[in-house]
């Protein structure tokens, strides 16, 4: 017997559906109506035939009461080829729900998204996460998707994007967006970051994550942030192959005084990079290749410093003199 495609936990909190059959019984998903967290994985299916079975242009208000009754707050949809029209239909219906967090992963969106009808209401998400989502519309995808969302989005995460740069002139400002995560876009680079950080479209950013994004130097990132007018409080540059030295011909970049937390862990650094902010609350340099202790002008003033997992601290990799101190903690790097 084939396993049930959907599983609801005992608390009716989390429901996960894996539709791997070529002709799945989508009605199985109805057992998820009581769940708060719902995950639907479509096994890479093309949902084009769905368009024939549903009226994507139907007025979603007829479903409003039913949708409002749903408990779902977090929804993940993955592994499918989805016509843009179908996605829009789903967003229009979900606009009446209490959904707060939407994750789309391993999706191929085909066709163009129609504009938001005047009478339609946007989806009031606080968090939108996209991983490996491709859009037929290329660089304008964010602007097209944005019009279907209310302006209160707080968290936006875009990983493994096929086009991490956006058509900035079409994108409206995200006035409430405090966290932007562009991690796991190894082809982004510092030039791509400048293109992705549409100037003045992200005025409220506090947390910016750029893990594994092909960044080269902290100074280059500083320049991209300055150009975009983005002033995060927290910046994560971990898991990039960073160079410690700055090109002498490159102009010196002044970090925003708002920045108080910088993560440079797992960055392959052999020395503390030049051109860091003068003062930080948190600096994470763990799991790098620092083979000697920093001298006083090589570190900014930091309240909370993490250096664990560097060769100069790991017993056996260097000969510490009598009385030298290491943390005694050797993390798995």
């Amino acid at each position: 017997t084939t396993p049930e495609p959907c599983e609801l936990d005992d608390e009716d909190f989390r429901c996960v559906c894996n539709f791997s059959e070529p002709q799945p019984d989508w009605s199985e998903a109805f057992q998820c109506v009581s769940a708060v967290e719902v995950e639907i994985h479509a096994g890479g299916l093309n949902l084009e035939p769905f368009l024939k079975r549903v009226d994507a242009d139907a007025d979603p208000r007829q479903y409003a009461d039913t949708v409002k009754a749903l408990r779902v707050r977090r929804l993940t949809v993955g592994a499918a080829q989805v016509p843009a029209q179908l996605l829009v239909g789903a967003l229009r219906v979900l606009a009446y729900s209490r959904l707060k967090e939407l994750t789309l992963e391993d999706l191929k969106i085909t066709g163009t998204m129609p504009p938001l009808p005047l009478e339609a209401t946007g989806l009031a998400l606080s968090s939108l996460r996209l991983r490996n989502v491709s859009w037929a519309t290329g660089r304008s995808w964010l602007a097209e998707l944005q019009q279907w969302l209310k302006p209160g989005l707080k968290v936006l995460s875009i990983a493994q994007a096929h086009s991490p740069a956006f058509s900035c002139e079409q994108v409206r400002a995200f006035p409430a967006l405090t966290s932007l995560d562009l991690s796991d876009n190894p082809g982004l680079g510092e030039r791509g970051l400048m293109a992705a950080l549409c100037p003045h479209k992200f005025p409220a950013i506090q947390n910016l994550a750029l893990r594994n994004t092909g960044m080269e130097t902290p100074t280059g990132v500083c320049a991209a942030l300055a150009a975009a007018g983005v002033q995060p409080h927290s910046l994560d540059l971990s898991h990039n192959s960073l160079r410690a030295t700055v090109n002498p011909s490159a102009p010196r970049c002044m970090w925003s005084s708002a920045l108080n937390s910088l993560n440079l862990s797992f960055a392959g650094l052999e020395q503390v990079p030049k051109g860091l902010p003068a003062k930080l609350r948190v600096l994470d340099l763990s799991c790098n290749r620092l083979n000697r202790a920093p001298q006083p002008d090589e570190l900014p003033e930091v309240d909370n410093l993490t250096l664990d997992g560097n060769p100069f601290l790991v017993p056996g990799t260097a000969l510490p003199h009598e009385g030298s101190m290491n943390s005694g903690v050797v993390p798995a790097c």
């Epitope: 202790a293 001298q295 570190l299 410093l305 101190m325």
Partner: antibody
């Protein structure tokens, strides 16, 4: 073992210059910053500043920004303190001392773990 | 610059007694205070770093405590060999670093 050996005592006239050496052995010279500390007769210790032994960049305390020069001869694992245009108030013992980095679960800093024996400089007309 | 005020300037003490001296920073220095011992005609020696950590080879009769602006250095069982001048130094994470004026230990 780790040692800092300083040059011998100096007797100078006002207006002259003096250059004191501090030769390090027993450790990798360029891994630790070198500091200079002044002690006038009967007085306490006064931190003069330090030099980054990787880059050669000196940092001077406010009272020592004018006539004082820190330098290195890395190949000889030696740090130097030069005082120009000497005056009576420069009469003191000058110590070199290595600053060692300390780190333990988020807390860090430097302390002076090895000191040279001091070089006495007397300025008298 | 941060000013380190040490008190008292001198203490008369007998062998075997407990001796305590203080150091006050003009602003918060966290736990960034070290204590050094200087005997007549010698260079200073590190005893305590980061307010309370005893340096390698330093006898356990020497202890340090405090944080913020107030720091204390104690010799629990005074020995004749401990006669010296003791200096506190603030080693806040970025220079300039400053020493206190010193406390001289003398025999009663």
């Amino acid at each position: 073992q780790i040692q800092l050996v300083q040059s011998g005592p100096e007797l100078k006239k006002p207006g002259e210059s003096v250059k004191i050496s501090c030769k390090a052995s027993g450790y990798t010279f360029t891994d630790y910053a070198m500091n200079w500390v002044k002690q006038a007769p009967g007085n306490g210790l006064k931190w003069m500043g330090w030099i980054n032994t990787q880059t050669g960049k000196p940092t001077y305390a406010d009272d020592f920004k004018q006539r004082f020069v820190f330098s290195l001869e890395t190949s000889a694992s030696t740090a130097y303190l030069q005082i120009n245009n000497l005056n009576i108030e420069d009469t003191a013992t000058y110590f070199c001392t290595r600053s060692t980095f300390y780190y333990s679960s988020y807390i860090y800093g430097w302390y002076f773990d090895f000191w040279g024996p001091g070089t006495s400089v007397t300025v008298s007309s | 610059d941060i000013v380190m005020t040490q008190s008292p300037t001198s203490i008369s003490i007998s062998v075997g007694e407990r001796v305590t001296m203080n150091c006050k920073a003009s602003q918060n220095v966290g736990s960034n205070v070290d204590w050094y011992q200087q005997k007549t005609g010698q260079s200073p020696k590190l005893l305590i770093y980061k307010a309370s950590n005893r340096y390698t080879g330093v006898p356990d009769r020497f202890t340090g405590s405090g944080s913020g602006t107030d720091f204390t250095f104690t010799i629990s069982n005074m020995q004749a060999v401990d006669l010296a001048v003791y200096y506190c130094m603030q080693s806040n994470t970025n220079p300039p670093w400053t020493f206190g004026g010193g406390t001289k230990l003398e025999l009663k």
